[in-house]
Interface confidence: low
């Protein structure tokens, strides 16, 4: 492959939180800590900032196979084990064939546990690495184009996802539900809040000509639920309601 090494300014910068971020380790070494009490207070401050980060969206630079850099935003509370699934869904990769490497701003590898929230780690870059089973050079992947989609939910809330416009809503639903923190099995995708007709999950965003939609959690939203549940059942009978194929045990 003939991809240039990106200049530092080419890589998307991680969005810095409004709260004052802790000093990076390289700088704290030279901080004049006058007493043990100050040191404890400083540590407590850093921990507090890290806990604040869990409640914020973290922008990450994601390095895909083929050294292609994309930018994505994840919630700080997302555990590392979910991050792999989330990223692979976003970029059409098989999670069982990839692992994650984390790099800090200083390009040092960051060690993590599967249940560590991403916001607790000062991550600058996430590298999706193919599991090298046979030592062959991975095929460079030109990612399928993604588009920005506005998801409206809970009547007044909005969130943005970047997804493939060619993927069916059935494939996109887990990503949408993850963003809205909804249960996929009890979520309806509608054109807008006023709409009564759930969208056809076999269709893609391009098929439907949509770049904005409404996610309704039928557990929480009482507005015409019984009607919607009937529609859901009807759709389910047609075979395209369930976002996930339930295992036939």
């Amino acid at each position: 492959m003939d991809g240039r090494t990106p200049r530092p300014q080419d890589a998307p910068a991680r969005r810095k939180p409004k709260a004052k971020a802790p000093l990076p380790p390289a700088e704290t070494k030279y901080t004049d800590v006058s007493s043990a009490a100050d040191s404890v207070e400083s540590t407590a401050f850093i921990m507090e900032q890290k806990e604040n980060m869990i409640d914020k969206d973290v922008e990450l630079s994601v390095v895909l196979p083929g050294d292609i850099i994309k930018s994505t935003t994840v919630h700080g509370s997302k555990p590392m084990m979910d991050l792999l699934i989330f990223l692979c869904a976003q970029y059409h990769l098989n999670p069982s064939s990839y692992t994650i490497d984390l790099l800090s701003a200083e390009q040092n590898h960051i060690k993590f546990k599967p249940n560590t929230p991403i916001g607790m780690l000062e991550v600058e870059k996430v590298i999706l690495k193919p599991k090298m089973l046979d030592k062959k050079k991975p095929t460079p992947i030109i990612p399928e184009k993604t588009v920005r989609v506005v998801i409206n939910f809970k009547k007044t809330q909005k969130t943005i996802v970047r997804v493939s416009p060619h993927a069916s809503l059935q494939e996109l639903a887990p990503i949408i539900c993850s963003k809205c923190e909804f249960d996929p099995l009890h979520t309806l995708l509608l054109k807008d809040y006023q709409s009564q007709e759930p969208l056809d999950l076999t269709k893609s965003l391009n098929d439907l000509g949509l770049r904005e939609l409404y996610a309704m959690d039928v557990n929480r939203e009482s507005c015409q639920i019984s009607q919607n549940l009937d529609i859901m059942k009807e759709k389910e009978n047609k075979g395209f309601f369930s976002f996930f194929q339930r295992s036939k045990k």
């Epitope: 492959m1 991809g3 095929t139």
Partner: antibody, heavy 116, light 113 residues
């Protein structure tokens, strides 16, 4: 409406240089990989260069590597192909194309003739 | 590099007939992500190529349903159910599974018998 308009073609002597341009409109330019593809006088299509949507990554076939440079200006919605050390076998119609994993829109092309 | 071979080189047809163009790749075009990145383009006389079919069988927007793509692995086919005058031109297959380089077939000229 997606539009790609190439310009800059012409007659060049072997060993010479030329820069092609492609003006894009009707879509968010910075969202797409862009490509140059050429069509030889025998009507064969050959991919010549590719550039990532942000401009950080460039790709070339061995036949042009080291001689051609693809670049883009996302602020101006322009794609470029700087060609040097031109050879007679570079004679072709040059198209710019948009896409990620297929070329969904092509320009009308600009002709390069390399001859002494 | 993946070599794409198209047959026939030229395909004389009568209007209203069915036409079939074959494309064979030197290696499987099934990507590790499960997709097959095989596409078809049509270049009408005096025009630039236009996308017809992407990922084996998906018609691009505005492409009539008389065009259909099929195949898997290394063997692919483009069918035109009833040839119309506007379908005449050169058809190219192309792959983007193993990239770079992006590679094209040599083309098949659809012409009136």
């Amino acid at each position: 409406e997606v539009q790609l308009v190439e310009s800059g073609g012409g007659l060049v002597k072997p060993g010479g240089s030329l820069k092609l341009s492609c003006a894009a409109s009707g879509f968010t330019f910075s969202d797409y990989y862009m490509y140059w593809v050429r069509q030889t006088p025998e009507k064969r299509l050959e991919w010549v260069a590719a550039i990532s949507n942000g401009g950080s990554y460039t790709y070339y076939p061995d036949s042009v590597k080291g001689r051609f440079t693809i670049s883009r200006d996302n602020a101006k919605n322009n794609l470029y192909l700087q060609m040097s050390s031109l050879k007679s076998e570079d004679t072709a119609m040059y198209y710019c194309a948009r896409g990620d994993y297929y070329f969904d829109y092509w320009g009308q092309g600009t002709t390069l003739t390399v001859s002494s | 590099d993946v070599v794409m071979t198209q047959t026939p080189l030229s395909l004389p047809v009568s209007l209203g007939d069915q036409a079939s163009i074959s494309c064979r790749s030197s290696q499987s075009l099934v990507h590790s992500n499960g997709n097959t990145y095989l596409h078809w383009y049509l270049q009408k006389p005096g025009q630039s190529p236009k996308l017809l079919i992407y990922k084996v069988s998906n018609r691009f927007s505005g492409v009539p349903d008389r065009f259909s793509g099929s195949g898997s692995g290394t063997d692919f086919t483009l069918k035109i159910s009833r040839v119309e005058a506007e379908d005449l031109g050169v058809y190219f297959c192309s792959q983007s599974t193993h990239v770079p380089p992006w590679t094209f077939g040599g083309g098949t000229k659809l012409e009136i018998k």
